[in-house]
Interface confidence: low
């Protein structure tokens, strides 16, 4: 038992619909015989139905947890003694227990049950960016870009809206980019302009609101 | 190995009705579970589907005639089939979804079918 011995956190955090990588480092007796290849699995605790289906693993012949599959990787080799976790488009019910199990047919099998990983979902508290290059002029056409600089790139892309209660530019009340372009108008002045960005793979949006400062160039005539 | 075991078809009158069962052996649990049907010479269809909590999904076709339910604790699958049409005739297939992937193919379990025939 000496010999089996995996380092990792005790406890990661991450927020729903973004991604946490947990580096992890596996150790198992070496047996000079020939063996086949080890294979490692990622595991969740306590699971009733289908104890035995990792939530990731590094066999091809393996069943996986549909409800993981895609957004759990065993990024690291276990051959290489990594047992390195990536999670995407993380959800609330992620949130559970997890424990690695190394295979090398036909001898060992070890499920590292006293290294447990301690994974917590919380909800996602952040908020996109709305970025206004300048001042909005009446009349002049301006890109207005919704971003959200903390979601990371290997999730699954999320879905941007605009909403507005009165933009007379807007053609229709949404628009599918990250990019608004529009032309704002003086009545368009105090307008709350609302981006919207939804996070698919777990579910979830967020959403940022500001008041449009619309100014006039000297000269321009009040309607 | 997880095995599905199909009863309740036959031959019925239009107009009559027919119970159809599906039960699993083998231990699996199951998330969501459905009914599909082939008449000879078209291709599967979906009947009617129902998740682990109990919401339902029926075809249109279907809809007010046949109502799908499950035994959670049994394991089993029932479709209760009211006001037969000649139409309905077709190979009965159960479908169980246990929530698994394979090579990050979803794993399905199929029944071998049941036989149903409305004719007078």
């Known amino acids: 038992d000496l010999e089996f011995q995996l380092v990792a956190p005790e406890s990661v955090t991450v927020e729903e619909g973004l991604c946490v990588h947990v580096p992890c480092s596996v150790f198992y007796p070496s047996i000079k015989l020939t063996l086949g290849p080890v294979t490692g699995s990622w595991l969740r605790k306590g699971v009733s139905l289908h104890e035995d289906s990792p939530v990731a693993t590094s066999d091809p012949r393996q069943l996986v947890q549909k409800a993981t599959q895609g957004r759990f990787q065993l990024l690291g080799d276990p051959q290489k003694h990594d047992c390195s976790l990536f999670i995407r488009d993380a959800q609330k019910n992620d949130t559970g227990m997890y424990f690695f199990r190394v295979v090398r047919e036909p001898f060992v099998r070890y499920s590292y049950k006293k290294s447990q990983l301690s994974l917590h979902v919380t909800s996602l508290s952040r908020t996109p960016d709305i970025i206004i290059p300048g001042t909005l002029e009446a009349g002049y056409p301006s890109n207005l870009t919704c971003s959200v600089p903390w979601a990371c790139e290997q999730g699954t892309p999320p879905t941007f809206s605009w909403m507005s209660t009165a933009l007379t530019s807007l053609s229709s009340r949404t628009t599918d980019s990250s990019v608004l372009t529009f032309t704002p108008q003086p009545q368009d002045h105090g307008t709350k302009l609302t981006c919207l960005v939804t996070f698919s793979g777990a579910g979830v949006t967020v959403e940022r609101t500001i008041q449009l400062n619309v100014t006039r160039k000297s000269g321009q005539m009040r309607e | 190995e997880v095995q599905l075991v199909e009863s309740g078809g036959g031959l019925v009158q239009p107009g009559g009705s027919l119970r159809l069962s599906c039960a699993a052996s083998g231990g699996t649990f199951v998330i969501n579970a459905a009914w599909y049907r082939q008449a000879p010479g078209k291709q599967r269809e979906l009947v009617a589907s129902i998740s682990y909590g109990g919401s339902t999904n029926y075809a249109d076709r279907v809809a007010g005639r046949f109502t799908i339910s499950r035994d959670n604790a049994k394991n089993s699958l029932y479709l209760q089939m009211n006001s037969l049409r000649a139409e309905d005739t077709a190979v009965y297939y159960c479908?169980?979804?246990?929530?698994?992937?394979?090579?990050?193919?979803?794993?399905?379990?199929w029944g071998q079918g049941t036989m149903v025939t409305v004719s007078s």
């Open positions: 479908r169980l979804d246990p929530g698994l992937a394979l090579n990050n193919r979803p794993l399905y379990y």
